[in-house]
C-alpha cells in the first residue's frame, strides 16, 4: 500500500533550521533507510506531498501553513503530517491535526504550548523543546545552589518569531514548577538604545544570576555594559541562551570558540567581561553514526537541493526529523503488524510515546507525553587562552549533569556567586546596616 | 439552482451579539423575505449549514471556528460564509475565506485589522466597526476644538475577549490618522484595585479629554474618584465608550438612563460626578421597519430558538446581519443576470462595496472596502433630571454631526475644557511660572 | 530644551595645557554616553573622544591618546575635556556631543551638539 | 581602526534632482552607520542612525541603505535647504570615525 506523509514547511526560505532545504535531505535519507529495512513496512510505499508553511514573503505564516494542511488532507487524505517547525505555524496546523486525529510529527515547536496534548493530541516533538531546557536550568540551578532568585532578559528582534519570548516562556515555566525560586522576566529591543539603559538599571536589583537570550552581538553588548558598570563575574554570572551556539560558531561572525572577538576596538574589554559569561547551547551527538549522517545530508542537500549546508548545531534539527520519520515508521509497522491501520492515528503515537530509539542523533527518548527528552551543554572560557569549550553536559533521559574531564566551571571567587547578595539587593538586610563604630553601653 | 451559506457563529452561547440565537431569526426573517420577493434569486432555494465557532465550553475560539469552516468547506462548498462575529474566531475563518475567494459576510468582526482587505479579501462587514468609531471622535474633536491631547483607558476583563484593546485600537489607530493629535492610551483590569491608583495619577499628567471603555460598574467607579480627586467637569470630560449602551438600559442594572445610580450610598457623588461625563453608542435605528423588525425578530427567536430577546442596541446586529444578507443576495441575483454564477466571489462582493440599500436597519451604505459606514449617538446628563439623553448624532455616510434639536451639550463653564490646560499638564508653560513680585530695578 | 554649551577655548601656545567644558541641559546627563568631535578650519569632523555614562568606558582617537584626558560629573551635569602637551595640528572648533546610547559599547550616533568652542595652538 | 571613505568628495546638483552619496567602511560594520549633514557655520545635524533609520524631523526625501561595508545616502528630490556638508561615522568600534565628507553644492 501507499503511506502518505503531508509535509509542511518553510519551501523556499532556507534559513529556517527546518527549512524544507534542510529537512529535505534527511526525508530522503530516512526513507532510503527504511527501503534499505525488510523489516520496516514491507510491501509498503512511502511518499511525501509538500505544502509550504510560509507566506510570498518567506516567512512562516499562521495562515499558510493551516491553509496548506488543508488543502493536503482534502487532496491526499494522510496518514500523518510533518512540521510545521515554526511556532506559529504550528500551533493552528496542530490543532487541525488533533481534531482530524493524525498524527502530526516534528522536530520544530518547542514552545512550552505544544506539551499540552489535550490541545495538541497526537503532535509528537522529536526534536528539542524549550520546556526541557528548563529541567536543565533547574539541575543547574540544584548543583550551584541557586534556589532563590534568576532573572531572565529575552530580545525581541523583528521577523524572529519571538524565538526568545517563547524559549524563555518555557524555561521559566518549567524552572518555577521545579524550584521554588523567584524568576523575573523582561523584555529588551536589540535595536532600541533606550532599552540597554533599563536593562543595566534593571540588573543589579533584580538578578546576580542573569539568563540572557539574544543575538550574539547584543549579548556581547549587555557583557560589555556589565563590565563597565561593574556588574563583574565575582558577583554576577551571565547565561547566554544560545540553542543552536551561534556564537561559537566563528565564520561571518566572531572567531570560533571565542565569542567575544569582534575586532571593533573593544575585544580587550569584551574578553574580561566574557570572564562573567557562560554559554547554553543543545548538545552536539558525539556518536559515530552522526557525523557519517552529516556527510551524507550535506552531499545530498548540495545535490538534489541545490543547497550549501553550513556547521552547526542547526543540523541536529534535520537529524531529529530524519530520527522522528523512522520512529514514526517503526510504529506504524507494529500497528500494522497488531491488525490496525496506517490511519489509526491514537495507536501509532502510543507506540511512539514513552519509548526508547537508537537514531543518527543517538539515543532517543520520548517521553510519556510524547516529547523527546533533550541535552545541552554548558560552555565556560578558559581563562589561559580565552576560548570557550563545553565543560558540562546534561543528559535529558537521565537528568543528570556530567561534568567533561578534566575541565571545570571558572568561577573568579573559587565559587559559584550567591543568587542573591549578601545583603539583598536594596541592602534591605539590617545585619548589612549596623553602625561600624562600637559602642559601649 | 441552490444558494449555500455557511454560518459560523457561536450555537450554544447566547451571551455573543452574534449568537446564533439571536441571528438566525435574522437569517430566516431575512430569507422570507426572498422567498416573497420575485425579484431576487426567482428559482432557488437558499439554505444555510451551521458550524459553530465556540469551543468546548462555549467561548468564541480560533480553533473551533476555523475547523468548522474547513469542515463546512469540505462537505458543503457554500457560495458565501456569514460569521463569525468575535475577532478571534473571525481572524483565521477570514484569511480562509480570502484564499478560497468566497465571500465572507459578518455584522461582527468590528476590529481594525479586519479592514485590511489585502489579508481580508471578499469580507464585507455590514454591522459597526471600530475605526468608523474614530471617523466620530475625530468629527468631535474638530467640532469641540481639541485637536492636541487626548487619552484613552481601555480595561481588559478575562474572557471578554479583549473587546476594549479592539475597541480602542481602532479608535486610536483613525483619530490619529484623521486628526494631528496626541493620544496616550493605557490597559487597566478592572478587577485590580492597584490599577485605579495609577488611572487617578495618571489623568492628571495625560489628558483632559478622556475616553474610557470598561463596564458600566468600572465607569462608575472611575468617576467617583475623579471626583475625589478634584478631576471635574470644569477642566475634565469623560467619554463612556459604551457602545451598546448597557449602562443606559436599566433592568437588572442602573436605572433607565440614570447611569450613575445603583443605590449603595454614593448615588448623589455619582451624579455630580457624571456631570463630566458622557456617553458614545451606537445609535439606535429610528425608521418604522426596525420597530417592526424587533417585533417579529423577538417573536421567531422565542417560537423556534426557544430565546427571550432583551430590549437594547445588541439587536441591531442581528439587524445588520439581516440586512447583510439581503445585500448579498440582491448581488448575487444581479451577478447572475449579468451571466455569472454563484461561485463569483469576486464579482458578487464587488457588487455588495461602494453601494447603498434600504434595510430594516435603515439607510445602509458599505463604504469602497466592504465596510458599513456606522451612525453613532452622543449622550449627555440633563442636568435638572440627571437622566442621559441624545444631544448629537453621528452620520456616518455623509459624516456629519447632527444635533438633536433643543438639546445642547452640557459644559459646566458654558464651553468645552481645553484638551491641553492653559499652563501645560505639567505646569510647564514659562508664562504661568512667572515670579508673581513685580520688582523695580 | 535640550542642549549642550561649550567653553574654555581661547589661543594657547604649543605644549601648554587647556581645559575645555561642556554645560549640558534638558535631558538626563547619566542616562548618556557623551563625545567632542573636533573640526580644523576648513576641514571635515575628527572624533577625539568619547565616555560611557558612568566613566566606565573612555575611548580616545590614536592622536590624542596619552595627551587629553575626558572626564565627566554626573552631579553637575558637565563634561570636559583636558589637553595637555597641545600642538598646532589641535586648532580645531571643538564640539561636545550627546549620545543616543548609554555606553560607546552601543552604537548611538549623536544627536544633539553643542555650538561649539574655538582651540587656536600658536605660538 | 575603522576607516571610513566617501565618494564623491564634491558634487553639483540642482533643485529637485537625485542625489547619492556613498560611503565605504574598511571593515564590516554591520549596519552601525550614521549620517550627518553640516551647513557653514553650524553644528552638524544627525539625519539617519544605523543606515537607515530616519531621525525625527528630518525630511523623508532623505533615505539611507547598507550594511557590512557599503552604504549609500539618497536625497530624492534636491530642495535649497539641503547644500551642505554630509558626513558618514561608523558606530561599530571605538574609535569612532567620521567620512571626510561629501559637498553638495549648487550647480
Known amino acids: 500500500g501507499n503511506l502518505t506523509v503531508a509535509v509542511v514547511l518553510p519551501l523556499a526560505n532556507t534559513s529556517y533550521p527546518w527549512s524544507w532545504a534542510r529537512v529535505g535531505p534527511a526525508v530522503e535519507l530516512a526513507l532510503a533507510r527504511v527501503k534499505a529495512r525488510p523489516d520496516l513496512l514491507p510491501g509498503w510505499t512511502v511518499r511525501t506531498v509538500l505544502g509550504s508553511s510560509e507566506n510570498a514573503l518567506g516567512v512562516c505564516s499562521d495562515t499558510a501553513a493551516p491553509l496548506a494542511a488543508v488543502d493536503l488532507k482534502w487532496e491526499h487524505n494522510p496518514a500523518a503530517f510533518l512540521g510545521p517547525g515554526c511556532v506559529y505555524a504550528a500551533a493552528p496546523v496542530g490543532r487541525f491535526t488533533a481534531h482530524w486525529r493524525v498524527p502530526l510529527l516534528t522536530a520544530g515547536a518547542p514552545a512550552l504550548g505544544f506539551g499540552v496534548k489535550d490541545e495538541y493530541a497526537l503532535t509528537t516533538r522529536a526534536g528539542p523543546s524549550y520546556a526541557k531546557l528548563g529541567d536543565f536550568v533547574a539541575a543547574l540551578h540544584r548543583r550551584l545552589g541557586w534556589e532563590r532568585q534568576a532573572l531572565m532578559l529575552y530580545a525581541y528582534r523583528p521577523g524572529d518569531e519571538e524565538h526568545c519570548f517563547f524559549l524563555v516562556e518555557g524555561l521559566f515555566m518549567r524552572v518555577r514548577d521545579r524550584l521554588n525560586i523567584t524568576v523575573d522576566h523582561l523584555e529588551f529591543a536589540e535595536d532600541d538604545l533606550s532599552h540597554y539603559t533599563r536593562l543595566l538599571r534593571t540588573m543589579p536589583r533584580k538578578g546576580r544570576v542573569i539568563y540572557i537570550c539574544s543575538s550574539p552581538d547584543a549579548f556581547r553588548t549587555l557583557m560589555l555594559l556589565a563590565l563597565e558598570a561593574g556588574l563583574c563575574g565575582e558577583d554576577y554570572v551571565f547565561f547566554h541562551l544560545d540553542i543552536f551556539g551561534q556564537s561559537l560558531q566563528g565564520g561571518q561572525g566572531p572567531a570560533p570558540r571565542r565569542p567575544w572577538e569582534r575586532g571593533d576596538g573593544q575585544d580587550v574589554s569584551a574578553r574580561q567581561a566574557f570572564q562573567a559569561a557562560k554559554i547554553i547551547t543543545y548538545k552536539e551527538p558525539d556518536n559515530p553514526e552522526y557525523l557519517e549522517f552529516l556527510k551524507q545530508l550535506k552531499h545530498l542537500a548540495r545535490e538534489q537541493f541545490n543547497f550549501t549546508m553550513e556547521d552547526g548545531l542547526v543540523n541536529t534539527i534535520p537529524a531529529s526529523f530524519h530520527d522522528g520519520l523512522l520512529l514514526y515508521i517503526q510504529a506504524v509497522t507494529e500497528t500494522l503488524a497488531h491488525g490496525g491501520t496506517v490511519t489509526d492515528g491514537e495507536n501509532i503515537t502510543q507506540r511512539m510515546w514513552n519509548r526508547s530509539f537508537q537514531g543518527v542523533t543517538g539515543y532517543l527518548k520520548i517521553d510519556s507525553s510524547g516529547d523527546r527528552e533533550t541535552d545541552f551543554s554548558l560552555w565556560d572560557m578558559d581563562p589561559e587562552t580565552g576560548a570557550f569549550r563545553v565543560v558540562l553536559n546534561y543528559n535529558g533521559t537521565s537528568q543528570e549533569l556530567v561534568a567533561v574531564s578534566g575541565r571545570k566551571l571558572n568561577w573568579p571567587l573559587g565559587y559559584p556567586p550567591p543568587d542573591i547578595p549578601k545583603c539583598g539587593f536594596d541592602n534591605e538586610d539590617p545585619a548589612c546596616n549596623q553602625d561600624h563604630l562600637s559602642t559601649l553601653e | 439552482g441552490n444558494l449555500t451559506v455557511a454560518v459560523v457563529l457561536p450555537l450554544a452561547n447566547t451571551s455573543y451579539p452574534w449568537s446564533w440565537a439571536r441571528v438566525g431569526p435574522a437569517v430566516e426573517l431575512a430569507l422570507a423575505r426572498v422567498k416573497a420577493r420575485p425579484d431576487l434569486l426567482p428559482g432557488w432555494t437558499v439554505r444555510t449549514v451551521l458550524g459553530s465557532s465556540e469551543n468546548a465550553l462555549g467561548v468564541c475560539s480560533d480553533t473551533a471556528a476555523p475547523l468548522a469552516a474547513v469542515d463546512l468547506k469540505w462537505e458543503h462548498n457554500p457560495a458565501a460564509f456569514l460569521g463569525p462575529g468575535c475577532v478571534y474566531a473571525a481572524a483565521p475563518v477570514g484569511r480562509f475565506t480570502a484564499h478560497w475567494r468566497v465571500p465572507l459576510l459578518t455584522a461582527g468582526a468590528p476590529a481594525l485589522g479586519f479592514g485590511v482587505k489585502d489579508e481580508y479579501a471578499l469580507t464585507t462587514r455590514a454591522g459597526p466597526s471600530y475605526a468608523k468609531l474614530g471617523d466620530f471622535v475625530a468629527a468631535l474633536h474638530r467640532r469641540l476644538g481639541w485637536e492636541r491631547q487626548a487619552l484613552m483607558l481601555y480595561a481588559y476583563r478575562p474572557g471578554d475577549e479583549e473587546h476594549c484593546f479592539f475597541l480602542v485600537e481602532g479608535l486610536f489607530m483613525r483619530v490619529r490618522d484623521r486628526l494631528n493629535i496626541t493620544v496616550d492610551h493605557l490597559e487597566f483590569a478592572e478587577d485590580d484595585l492597584s490599577h485605579y491608583t495609577r488611572l487617578l495619577r495618571t489623568m492628571p499628567r495625560k489628558g483632559r479629554v478622556i475616553y474610557i471603555c470598561s463596564s458600566p460598574d468600572a465607569f462608575r467607579t472611575l468617576m467617583l474618584l475623579a471626583l475625589e480627586a478634584g478631576l471635574c467637569g470644569e477642566d475634565y470630560v469623560f467619554f463612556h465608550l459604551d457602545i451598546f449602551g448597557q449602562s443606559l438600559q436599566g433592568g437588572q442594572g442602573p436605572a433607565p438612563r440614570r447611569p450613575w445610580e445603583r443605590g449603595d450610598g454614593q448615588d448623589v457623588s455619582a451624579r455630580q460626578a457624571f456631570q463630566a461625563a458622557k456617553i458614545i453608542t451606537y445609535k439606535e435605528p429610528d425608521n418604522p421597519e426596525y420597530l417592526e423588525f424587533l417585533k417579529q425578530l423577538k417573536h421567531l427567536a422565542r417560537e423556534q430558538f426557544n430565546f427571550t430577546m432583551e430590549d437594547g442596541l445588541v439587536n441591531t446586529i442581528p439587524a445588520s446581519f439581516h440586512d447583510g444578507l439581503l445585500l448579498y443576495i440582491q448581488a448575487v441575483t444581479e451577478t447572475l443576470a449579468h451571466g455569472g454564477t454563484v461561485t463569483d466571489g469576486e464579482n458578487i462582493t464587488q457588487r455588495m462595496w461602494n453601494r447603498s440599500f434600504q434595510g430594516v436597519t435603515g439607510y445602509l451604505k458599505i463604504d469602497s472596502s466592504g465596510d458599513r459606514e456606522t451612525d453613532f449617538s452622543l449622550w449627555d446628563m440633563d442636568p435638572e433630571t440627571g437622566a442621559f439623553r441624545v444631544v448629537l448624532n453621528y452620520n456616518g455616510t455623509s459624516q456629519e454631526l447632527v444635533a438633536v434639536s433643543g438639546r445642547k451639550l452640557n459644559w459646566p463653564l458654558g464651553y468645552p475644557p481645553p484638551d491641553i490646560p492653559k499652563c501645560g499638564f505639567d505646569n510647564e508653560d514659562p508664562a504661568c511660572n512667572q515670579d508673581h513680585l513685580s520688582t523695580l530695578e | 530644551e535640550v542642549q549642550l554649551v561649550e567653553s574654555g577655548g581661547g589661543l594657547v601656545q604649543p605644549g601648554r595645557s587647556l581645559r575645555l567644558s561642556c554645560a549640558a541641559s534638558g535631558f538626563t546627563f547619566d542616562d548618556y554616553a557623551m563625545h567632542w568631535v573636533r573640526q580644523a578650519p576648513g576641514k571635515g569632523l575628527e572624533w577625539v573622544s568619547g565616555i560611557s555614562w558612568n566613566s566606565g568606558t573612555i575611548g580616545y582617537a590614536d592622536s590624542v591618546k596619552g595627551r587629553f584626558t575626558m572626564s565627566r560629573d554626573n552631579a553637575k551635569n558637565s563634561l570636559y575635556l583636558q589637553m595637555n602637551s597641545l600642538r598646532p595640528e589641535d586648532t580645531a572648533l571643538y564640539y561636545c556631543?550627546?549620545?543616543?546610547?548609554?555606553?560607546?559599547?552601543?552604537?548611538?550616533?549623536?544627536?544633539?551638539w553643542g555650538q561649539g568652542t574655538m582651540v587656536t595652538v600658536s605660538s | 581602526d575603522i576607516q571610513m571613505t566617501q565618494s564623491p568628495s564634491s558634487l553639483s546638483a540642482s533643485v529637485g534632482d537625485k542625489v547619492t552619496i556613498t560611503c565605504r567602511a574598511s571593515?564590516?560594520?554591520?549596519?552601525?552607520l550614521n549620517w550627518y549633514q553640516q551647513k557653514p557655520g553650524k553644528a552638524p545635524k544627525v539625519l539617519i542612525s544605523t543606515a537607515s533609520s530616519l531621525q525625527s524631523g528630518v525630511p523623508s526625501r532623505f533615505s539611507g541603505s547598507g550594511s557590512g561595508t557599503d552604504f549609500t545616502l539618497t536625497i530624492s528630490s534636491l530642495q535649497p535647504e539641503d547644500f551642505a556638508v554630509f558626513y558618514c561615522?561608523?558606530?561599530?568600534?571605538?574609535?569612532?570615525?567620521f567620512g571626510q565628507g561629501t559637498k553638495v553644492e549648487i550647480k
Open positions: 561615522q561608523q558606530s561599530f568600534g571605538i574609535p569612532r570615525t
Open positions: 571593515q564590516n560594520i554591520r549596519t552601525y
Open positions: 556631543a550627546k549620545d543616543m546610547g548609554v555606553s560607546l559599547a552601543l552604537w548611538g550616533a549623536f544627536d544633539i
